[in-house]
Amino acid sequence: SEEPPISLDLTFHLLREVLEMARAEQLAQQAHSNRKLMEIIGK
């Protein structure tokens, strides 16, 4: 069958992308906080 995806399929995909971006941002912030903490402890 040559059936295309519907918008619902593609909207869920968009939501997943947004959540993945948010997760990546959260991890980056966590890493930054950890680095800052290590700098403080290191001093």
Epitope: S1, E2, E3, P4, P5, I6, S7, L8, D9, L10, T11, H13, L14, E17
Partner: antibody, heavy 114, light 106 residues
Framework: EVKLEESGGGLVQPGGSIKLSCVAS????????MAWVRQSPEKGLEWVAE??????????FYAESVKGRFIISRDDSKSSVYLQMNSLRAEDTGTYYC?????WGTGTTVTVSS | QIVLTQSPAIMSASPGERVTISCSAS?????MYWYLQKPGSSPKPWIY???NLASGVPARFSGSGSGTSYSLTISSMEAEDVATYYC?????????FGGGTKLEIK
């Protein structure tokens, strides 16, 4: 909100060219297979062309009546799909809709007349 | 190409009446899609993948079928249901539409 918005229609002489555009929003455009459908009082609803997504190598398909005259293309970075219409005939007159199976735009009208 | 034949072409129903519109395919398809069009407006997706109602479609509408035989049913006709209904197949290229069923109210 999922939305498709067409533009570019107008009056064109037989043998002339025109390019239609459609901007999408509210979904992951790069994953979509986009199609153009037209409607006229004479022929009713008629599928014109379709372009698959990148995963399917942006494969294109055309109705026999437009093959060799129309070109469908897309720009995923702009969430847009286009229909380049060449060698236009009177029978190409109609309202052109940008579509997904479950979403249609409001259409743009093309009139081919001298 | 797959030819879709809708029946009836025109029909009239009384308020509260059950309405069934049929769409017959010349060869087997995996799903059917339905669109509603009111005069002066663009077609609206109404039922997708045979039986799923598009957003905002009243629950009195339903879709069913398989193979070469599909239908759209209105359990209880209302004045706002007056429109032309089209079926479409996405099973293969070229995509094709039925000729439409114009639904009127008595």
């Amino acid at each position: 909100e999922v939305k498709l918005e067409e533009s570019g229609g107008g009056l064109v002489q037989p043998g002339g060219s025109i390019k239609l555009s459609c901007v999408a929003s509210g979904f992951t455009f790069s994953g979509a297979w986009m199609a153009w459908v037209r409607q006229s009082p004479e022929k009713g609803l008629e599928w014109v062309a379709e372009i698959k997504n990148k995963a399917n190598n942006h494969a294109t398909f055309y109705a026999e009546s437009v093959k060799g005259r129309f070109i469908i293309s897309r720009d995923d970075s702009k969430s847009s799909v286009y229909l380049q219409m060449n060698s236009l005939r009177a029978e190409d007159t109609g309202t052109y809709y940008c579509t997904l199976p479950d979403v249609w735009g409001t259409g743009t009208t093309v009139t081919v007349s001298s | 190409q797959i030819v879709l034949t809708q029946s009836p072409a025109i029909m009239s129903a009384s308020p509260g009446e059950r309405v069934t519109i049929s769409c017959s395919a010349s060869s087997s398809v995996s799903n059917m899609y339905w669109y509603l069009q009111k005069p002066g407006s663009s077609p609206k997706p109404w039922i997708y993948r045979t039986s799923n109602l598009a957003s905002g479609v009243p629950a009195r509408f339903s879709g069913s079928g398989s193979g070469t035989s599909y239908s759209l049913t209105i359990s209880s006709m209302e004045a706002e249901d007056v429109a032309t209904y089209y079926c479409q197949q996405y099973h293969s290229f070229p995509r094709t539409f039925g000729g439409g069923t114009k639904l009127e109210i008595k």
